[in-house]
């Protein structure tokens, strides 16, 4: 009886098992019982990354600099181009189809995790004893100045956005 299923790296066509084309090659013509599957290498800027029966190779991804993208890894006949973002930007999706600027942490918040090529900045509110008075994508919350270590006293209490203000000891005391 004709086959109803085929081995790995084969496909069923016209009641016959034909070899799939290897990664980096596309299908030109199906096998017959007299000749094997005819495959051709993908052209420049094309790829196929699996054993396949595709009649057209896929185009390599274009890393559009207008979208903040650059090439992280050049594509081959078997792999797609991998894009990443320019410094200071990160991908908007796993596929990295476009980039956005890293989000800065506003005053009162500091950087808990710095942004990467694929993730945005993670901010945290500055806890008591810490402050941030700038909008930054890399500054952490800074500890309030310790007036005591400078032989000074607190003249104005700190907040999550401002440092304490130190002043001289009251000389009358």
């Amino acid at each position: 009886e004709p086959p109803t299923a085929c081995r790995e790296k084969q496909y069923l066509i016209n009641s016959q098992c034909c070899s799939l084309c290897q990664p980096g090659q596309k299908l030109v013509s199906d096998c017959t019982e007299f000749t094997e599957t005819e495959c051709l290498p993908c052209g420049e800027s094309e790829f196929l990354d699996t054993w396949n029966r595709e009649t057209h190779c896929h185009q390599h991804k274009y890393c559009d600099p207008n979208l903040g993208l650059r090439v992280q890894q050049k594509g081959t006949s078997e792999t797609d181009t991998i894009c990443t973002c320019e410094e200071g930007w990160h991908c908007t999706s796993e596929a990295c189809e476009s980039c956005v600027l890293h989000t800065p942490c506003i005053p009162g918040f500091g950087v808990m995790e710095m942004a990467t090529e694929t993730t945005d900045t993670v901010c945290e509110p500055c806890p008591v004893g810490f402050f941030s008075n700038v909008s930054s994508a890399f500054e952490k919350c800074h500890p309030w100045t310790s007036c005591e270590t400078k032989d000074l006293v607190v003249q104005q209490a700190g907040t999550n956005k401002t440092d304490v203000v130190c002043g001289p000891q009251d000389r009358l005391r």
Epitope: P2, N14, S15, Q16, S29, T32, E33, F34, T35, E36
Partner: antibody
Framework: EVQLLESGGGLVQPGGSLRLSCAAS????????MSWVRQAPGKGLEWVSG????????YYADSVKGRFTISRDNSKNTLYLQMNSLRAEDTAVYYC??????????WGQGTLVTVSS | DIQMTQSPSSLSASVGDRVTITCRAS??????LNWYQQKPGKAPKLLIY???SLQSGVPSRFSGSGSGTDFTLTISSLQPEDFATYYC?????????FGQGTKLEIK
């Protein structure tokens, strides 16, 4: 024991026709692709035509396309080659062969076709 | 069609010799190549399939190698019954095509 026996060869005038037969025995004929291969006197082998198993497709060399027709009768375990519009360059020994995994593992003894006026 | 070119066209050798016949395809055929042996007045016999696999019943002194466009048939130690004509045949593209043959004669 696998056996292939060709018949139907002979002398024919240019433009004439002949039908070759190949009687198969010793195997399940319908399960195998079959082909015809020819060999002109003192020359090499030339694949002429093939027919798939289970009534599969038919295939021809460019040199015979449109003139030769391959067919099979699985109920009679017989392969045929209908040859029309014969030319002097078709003169050859014609072999039928069984196909397995893209190779011809069993061949008949051949039948001689002579095209001459 | 794919052209198959064998070399040499003929060669003389002695019993016990190691003999190599080459076959070149006009374009890449991966490992889709068979070798046949034909003796005068007889039908061809399949020796090697898929470039390097020995057909059942064929002596192990016969071996095949190669892929892409260049292939070889090697007989490690010639026996008297090996004097014959050898043909390569590709099945990478339709139609299947044969080389012109290599005639192996006794020296």
């Amino acid at each position: 024991e696998v056996q292939l026996l060709e018949s139907g060869g002979g002398l024919v005038q240019p433009g004439g026709s002949l039908r070759l037969s190949c009687a198969a025995s010793g195997f399940t004929f319908s399960s195998y692709a079959m082909s015809w291969v020819r060999q002109a006197p003192g020359k090499g082998l030339e694949w002429v035509s093939g027919i798939g198993s289970y009534g599969g497709g038919t295939y021809y060399a460019d040199s015979v396309k449109g003139r030769f027709t391959i067919s099979r009768d699985n109920s009679k375990n017989t392969l045929y080659l209908q040859m029309n519009s014969l030319r002097a360059e078709d003169t050859a020994v014609y072999y039928c062969a069984r196909y397995v995994n893209f190779g011809m593992d069993y061949w008949g003894q051949g039948t001689l076709v002579t095209v001459s006026s | 069609d794919i052209q198959m070119t064998q070399s040499p066209s003929s060669l003389s050798a002695s019993v016990g010799d190691r003999v190599t016949i080459t076959c070149r395809a006009s374009q890449s055929i991966s490992s889709y190549l068979n070798w046949y042996q034909q003796k005068p007045g007889k039908a061809p016999k399949l020796l090697i399939y898929a470039a390097s696999s020995l057909q059942s019943g064929v002596p192990s002194r016969f071996s095949g190698s190669g892929s892409g466009t260049d292939f070889t048939l090697t007989i490690s130690s010639l026996q008297p019954e090996d004097f014959a004509t050898y043909y390569c045949q590709q099945y990478g593209r339709n139609p299947p095509t044969f080389g012109q043959g290599t005639k192996l004669e006794i020296k």
